[in-house]
Interface confidence: medium
């Protein structure tokens, strides 16, 4: 025998109190699959969470974070604060990048400055907490008649020190 509840579509639940009739989900609840015996309570986006997608009878609400925060965890279950450029977020809060490292974004970790000498180049512009160094031409290119300037080396991936 087929379970009568299997006929209940998403957005409804199989109501045992009413002879297993398919009843619509009550307000602020949803069922995303058919055959459900209960509807799930909609997620509420409060405080630093804001609503990205409203709850419907067939899908949960989706949250993101208010300005100054960014999502962390599955389905944006947490909001982590942004830091300023030149800082990184540790478990104890934002802290300035150490000398020799930089962060040009409001999140992520401080990364080491590019080591120009590894590519045989000189430092054209010194690095700061917010910006990587800019590598210039190699010393050999600075001989009379050489005028081209090599574009800066790409920034290293987070967490990788120069080899």
């Amino acid at each position: 025998l087929q379970d009568p509840c299997s006929n209940c579509p998403a957005g409804t639940f199989c109501d045992n109190n009413r002879n297993q009739i398919c009843s619509p989900c009550p307000p602020n609840s949803f069922s995303s699959a058919g055959g459900q015996r209960t509807c799930d309570i909609c997620r509420q986006c409060k405080g630093v969470f804001r609503t990205r997608k409203e709850c419907s009878s067939t899908s949960n609400a989706e949250c993101d974070c208010t300005p100054g925060f960014h999502c962390l965890g599955a389905g944006c279950s947490m909001c982590e604060q942004d830091c300023k450029q030149g800082q990184e977020l540790t478990k104890k809060g934002c802290k300035d990048c150490c000398f020799g490292t930089f962060n040009d974004q409001k999140r992520g970790i401080c990364r080491p400055w590019t080591n120009c000498s590894l590519d045989g180049k000189s430092v054209l512009v010194n690095g700061t907490k917010e910006r990587d160094v800019v590598c210039g031409p190699s010393p050999a290119d600075l001989s009379p008649g050489a005028s081209s300037v090599t574009p800066p080396a790409p920034a290293r991936e987070p967490g990788h020190s120069p080899q």
Epitope: E80, L89, K91, K92
Partner: nanobody
């Protein structure tokens, strides 16, 4: 599948106690540091405490030091947070998290798995 499931949250009066549990599965529990963090509705994520994989080193946020105790039982694959002398400002959703290494990292980037959270409300 690596999974963390928190439990033990609830409503408690100021000055009361609660013990949160985090049941871990899908990985070698004793090989990784574990962390508790919390998120209050109006605030960003706040780190609470971390314990090393071996359980011999613990770290606490200043706001909970002396009131909260983190511990782990590798035979039960469970992480605990004993919370005493609770205050209204401790109200939050508490998440447990698995670190990527046996020793604690200063960063959330060291965290590779999060639980779904358990709600603690401190109110009279």
């Amino acid at each position: 599948e690596v999974q963390l499931v928190e439990s033990g949250g609830g409503l408690v009066q100021p000055g009361g106690s609660l013990r949160l549990s985090c049941a871990a599965s899908g990985f070698t529990f004793s090989s990784f540091a574990m962390t508790w963090v919390r998120q209050a509705p109006e605030k960003g994520l706040e780190w609470v405490s971390t314990i090393s994989g071996s359980g011999d080193t613990t770290y606490y946020a200043d706001s909970v030091k002396g009131r909260f105790t983190i511990s782990r039982d590798s035979s039960k694959n469970t992480l605990y947070l004993q919370m005493n002398s609770l205050r209204a400002e401790d109200s939050a959703v508490y998440f447990c998290a698995k670190e990527a290494t046996a020793m604690a990292s200063d960063y959330y980037y060291g965290v590779d798995v999060w639980g779904q959270g358990t709600t603690v409300t401190v109110s009279s």
